[in-house]
């Protein structure tokens, strides 16, 4: 059939909950480009139809939930206007009940499953949550060894879980936990995450760069909406939290109630000896208050700050 | 259960690169940190370097500029190369992970180890 | 570089002793890590986390220790652990090694 087969690593899964994967091969898929899902090489594609159990949604394939007998090699083929690509994924289900036995007797588990927290430095945990656009997630609830994680020391930042001053004692099993909404049912997403710990700096203690902002004021007018990013070069290893704060609080909480400023979801774009790194502040509406205030991007030990500023007059 | 196997030539000549691969099964080397570490005859054990999860290399400083540490997350396998040689580098060679009980900095797998001789 | 001075170098005692191992850094470290080797053999994992023992290593040895002076304790030696101990710190690189202790017996 001319299709150029190209074999992914396997996934390993867990049975009674939501799963997608995405049909991306960059640069395949960058140009116009026809995808369709098949399951275990049968000519039948996979559904289109949003209230079948398992269907494709634009490029994903979506389980909802994933089933034990849904164990086997997925296909997509991706054919463009002069080639045909075939990716092979295989999915293995399992029935996992994370309170009950340790995701330690589990060695070919995802790497997103496993991460490591660095002794005595601020570090993060990511619940890696992948769905299509109709997938609407709700807010992610952390738990360690099955019970719900409390304590100053741990703060929700979007899919992260931030960890300040981690301890020997943070190594362990995590599980994050979500809501997910799809055509106005909901499902439980629950990731189990084994968390080990390292005294290695890992990033050979460098410094993160902070290409944007550069310690300057940007002129917007009073009620407008600003969005402003901030780009970070940093090495692949490492370990360091990028967020927003405003008066030394994350912006997300110093705004909680109103939520009028908020941060976006970080984005990173790979390169061969580093990372660059976005995450963006968004003004809803620009108010009185926020003028002559710093809103400081912080990554790791760097920081740099923007202050908004009323445009001068003009009297043309 | 993860085993760590070193292979590669047991004699290498002064000047020339001793190069070792470790094949690591039971564990996927996009996960951890995968270290060398040798063992002088009659002397201490001494840290190489290691390459992390995200191919990111540390090297001891006494060593760093003749140690190359690199891997095939293909074959599963990471490697040592050691250039200009010298019978000072005669030792035990070994590779080793961490995990055990969640810390990565315990190195709790080791190969079995092989002997380089450096002469001519 | 932080370097790791174990004490003593080696040591005769008989079994059923009490034997301590010393190992002291010249910088503050965060934790310990204790090997047990055999001649001609691999090293072992012998305690991790300055405290914490290995799997299948006797609950006579003990670890101890922090900031610069770290112990390792064999309550009563037995013949199986007549070996060499190294300690090794991971808190700033270069990670290094003690230079060893052969315990042998008298």
């Known amino acids: 059939d001319g299709c150029k087969d190209i074999f992914m690593k396997n996934e390993i899964l867990s049975a009674s909950q939501p799963f997608a994967f995405n049909c991306t091969f960059p640069p395949i898929t960058s140009g116009e480009v026809s995808v369709t899902w098949y399951k275990n090489s049968s000519k039948i594609p996979v559904s289109k139809i949003i209230q079948s159990r398992i269907h494709q949604d634009e490029t994903w394939i979506l389980f909802l939930p994933m089933e034990w007998g849904d164990s086997g090699v997925y296909q997509c083929v991706i054919k463009g206007r002069d080639s045909c690509h075939r990716i092979h994924v295989n999915l293995t289900v399992f029935e996992k009940h994370w309170c009950d036995t340790s995701i330690g007797g589990l060695p070919n588990l995802s790497d997103e499953y496993k991460q490591i927290l660095h002794l005595g430095k601020d570090d993060s945990l990511t619940c890696h949550l992948h769905f299509p656009k109709s997938c609407v997630l709700g807010p992610i609830k952390w738990y360690k060894d099955c019970n719900e994680i409390k304590g100053e020391r741990f703060t929700v930042l979007e899919t992260r879980l931030l960890v300040s001053n981690v301890s020997a004692e943070d190594r362990g099993n995590y599980a994050c936990q979500a809501i997910l909404t799809h055509s106005g049912k909901q499902y439980e997403v629950l990731n189990g995450i084994t968390v080990s710990i390292t005294e290695r700096a890992g990033y050979g203690g460098s410094v993160p760069k902070i290409i944007y902002p550069k310690n300057h004021s940007i002129e917007v007018q009073l009620g407008t909406t600003l969005i402003v990013d901030c780009n970070v070069t940093d090495t692949k290893d490492n370990t360091n939290l990028r967020c927003w704060r405003v008066n030394n609080t994350l912006v997300d909480d110093y705004y909680d109630e109103s939520k009028r400023i908020r941060e976006g979801v970080e984005t990173h774009v790979s390169f061969r000896e580093h990372n660059l790194y976005t995450v963006n502040i968004t003004f809803l509406e620009v108010k009185m208050e926020d003028y002559g205030l710093p809103f400081m991007c912080h990554a790791g030990v760097s920081t740099a700050y923007i202050i908004l500023q009323l445009p001068a007059p003009d009297f043309r | 259960q993860v085993q760590l196997q070193e292979s590669g030539p047991g004699l290498v000549k002064p000047s020339q690169t001793l190069s070792l691969t470790c094949t690591v099964s039971?564990?996927?080397?996009?996960?951890g940190y995968w270290n060398w570490i040798r063992n002088h005859p009659g002397k201490g054990l001494e840290y190489i370097?290691?390459?992390?999860?995200?191919?990111?290399?540390y090297y001891n400083p006494s060593l760093k500029s003749r140690v190359t540490i690199s891997r095939d997350t293909s074959k599963n396998q990471f490697s040592l190369k050691l250039s200009s040689v010298t019978a000072a580098d005669t030792a035990v060679y070994y590779c080793?992970?961490?995990?055990?009980?969640?810390?990565?900095?315990?190195?709790?797998?080791w190969g079995q180890g092989t002997l380089v001789t450096v002469s001519s | 570089d932080i370097q790791m001075t174990q004490s003593p170098s080696s040591l005769s005692a008989s079994v059923g002793d009490r034997v301590t191992i010393t190992c002291r850094a010249s910088s503050n470290v965060r934790y310990m890590y204790w090997y047990q080797q055999k001649p001609g053999k691999a090293p072992k994992l012998w305690i991790y986390?300055?405290?914490n023992l290995a799997s299948g290593v006797p609950s006579r040895f003990s670890g101890s220790g922090s900031g610069t002076s770290y112990t390792l304790t064999i309550s009563s030696l037995q013949p199986e652990d007549f070996a060499t101990y190294y300690c090794q710190q991971f808190t700033t690189s270069p990670y290094t090694f003690g230079q060893g202790t052969k315990l042998e017996i008298k």
């Open positions: 986390l300055t405290s």
């Open positions: 080793a992970t961490g995990g055990y009980d969640y810390v990565e900095d315990a190195l709790y797998y």
């Open positions: 370097g290691y390459i992390s999860y995200s191919g990111y290399t």
């Open positions: 039971g564990a996927s080397i996009t996960s």
